[in-house]
Interface confidence: low
């Protein structure tokens, strides 16, 4: 399977929403000795590789963030967590995972990866992650709504894998 | 069926830091959870700090937060937990501790334990 | 985080007698609760995760209930084997909490 980033960059204003976006494509095993795992962290543009680097979000880890469950099924954080530190990551029945930032600042901008991980329990892992930058702006130059910017197919099926 | 092997016991001076080993066997290593638990003797179950291989960075509980060091070798297969600035109160038997769940915390697969006797 | 508390703290049994360990969490950890039974000298064995699932080879006088905040373990019919320490546990979030314990002892 592949994570693919349908958005390289989000430009937001001071105080907006935004949902980061990951896509599992490809064919997920749905056994029941298959369980994936989802979260999102922070990171910097390494020299040789992208989200290498694991940095908290809004003070809350890999751990706070992460969801787990066989294939494509639905799961989100828990909900107190969300209303505390306005974040709350998410997963469809279609491999859509995301993860929604409330009331941005602009201590928020940087890059951001999601990263998926399955595991065939005691056999082999498999990771894969997608990285996407968010701008947070203020002042007169920054837009009413967030923009998106489509990735490029090249980057958006972009690949890591253990 | 997964293993998981301590390092043997250990007698320390106050002040000083000690470090435990945790070799795993018989699985993959990298995606899960490997905790550690300590228990004083006569009390209940503490947990410490845990890390996941893949990150390579661990959560400390605040307790232990600047005194607790959690690493793992995914080489090796092996997670370390050493503490610094000893005292009497951290006598105690320290145990390793794994899900078979990925990065969930319900502990199945535990170590032997070691006791670690810190006195001057 | 999250407060553990369990009661009693120790109770006196006999074999066969239907025993009950209840747990509170400080807040709702929805069903992420498991349980420990603990001989001395030996490291915690899990009976019970997410609130009422039985562990793979643990006999099935073992049970466990409850969401939100209160939870439950029950020994249907207690065995000579089941005098030890029990522990619940909540893995809802770091860090990891666990309740002070409970012995079961023989009356």
């Known amino acids: 399977f592949k994570v693919a980033t349908p958005y390289s960059l989000y430009v937001c204003p001071e105080g907006q929403n935004v949902t980061l976006t990951c896509r599992l494509l490809g064919p997920v095993d749905k056994g029941h000795d298959v369980t994936f795992y989802k979260t999102w962290y922070r990171s910097s543009r390494g020299e040789v590789q992208t989200c290498s680097e694991r940095r908290p979000i809004r003070n809350l880890t890999f751990q706070d963030l992460h969801l787990h469950h066989g294939g494509h099924q639905a799961a989100n954080t828990s909900h107190d967590l969300a209303q505390r530190h306005g974040l709350e990551s998410a997963s469809d029945h279609h491999g859509n995972f995301s993860i929604t930032m409330r009331n941005l600042t602009l201590l928020d901008s940087g890059l951001y990866c999601c990263l998926v991980v399955e595991i065939r329990h005691h056999h082999s892992e498999h990771r894969v992650h997608g990285a996407m930058e968010l701008q947070v702006q203020t002042g007169k130059d920054a837009p009413s709504n967030c923009v998106v910017y489509p990735s490029s197919s090249q980057d958006s099926e972009n690949i890591t894998a253990a | 069926q997964v293993q998981l092997v301590q390092s043997g016991a250990e007698v320390k001076k106050p002040g000083s830091s000690v470090k435990v080993s945790c070799k795993a066997s018989g699985g993959t290593f990298s995606s899960y959870a490997i905790s550690w638990v300590r228990q004083a003797p006569g009390q209940g179950l503490e947990w410490m700090g845990g890390i996941i291989p893949i990150f390579g960075t661990a959560n400390y509980a605040q307790k232990f937060q600047g005194r607790v060091t959690i690493t793992a070798d995914e080489s090796t297969s092996t997670a370390y937990m050493e503490l610094s600035s000893l005292r009497s109160e951290d006598t105690a038997v320290y145990y390793c501790?794994?899900?078979?769940?990925?990065?969930?915390?319900?502990?199945?697969?535990w170590g032997q334990g070691t006791l670690v006797t810190v006195s001057s | 985080d999250i407060q553990m508390t369990q009661s009693p703290s120790s109770l006196s049994a006999s074999v066969g007698d239907r025993v009950t360990i209840t747990c509170r969490a400080s807040?709702?950890?929805?069903?992420?609760l498991n349980w420990y039974q603990q001989k001395p000298g030996k490291a915690p064995k899990l009976l019970i995760y997410s609130a009422s699932s039985l562990q793979s080879g643990v006999p099935s006088r073992f049970s466990g209930s409850g969401s939100g905040t209160d939870f439950t373990l029950t020994i249907s019919s207690l065995q000579p084997e089941d005098f030890a320490t029990y522990y619940c546990?909540?893995?809802?979030?770091?860090?990891?909490?666990f309740g002070q314990g409970t012995k079961v002892e023989i009356k």
């Open positions: 807040q709702s950890i929805r069903t992420d």
């Open positions: 546990q909540q893995n809802e979030r770091t860090p990891i909490t």
């Open positions: 501790a794994r899900s078979s769940y990925g990065w969930s915390y319900e502990f199945d697969y």
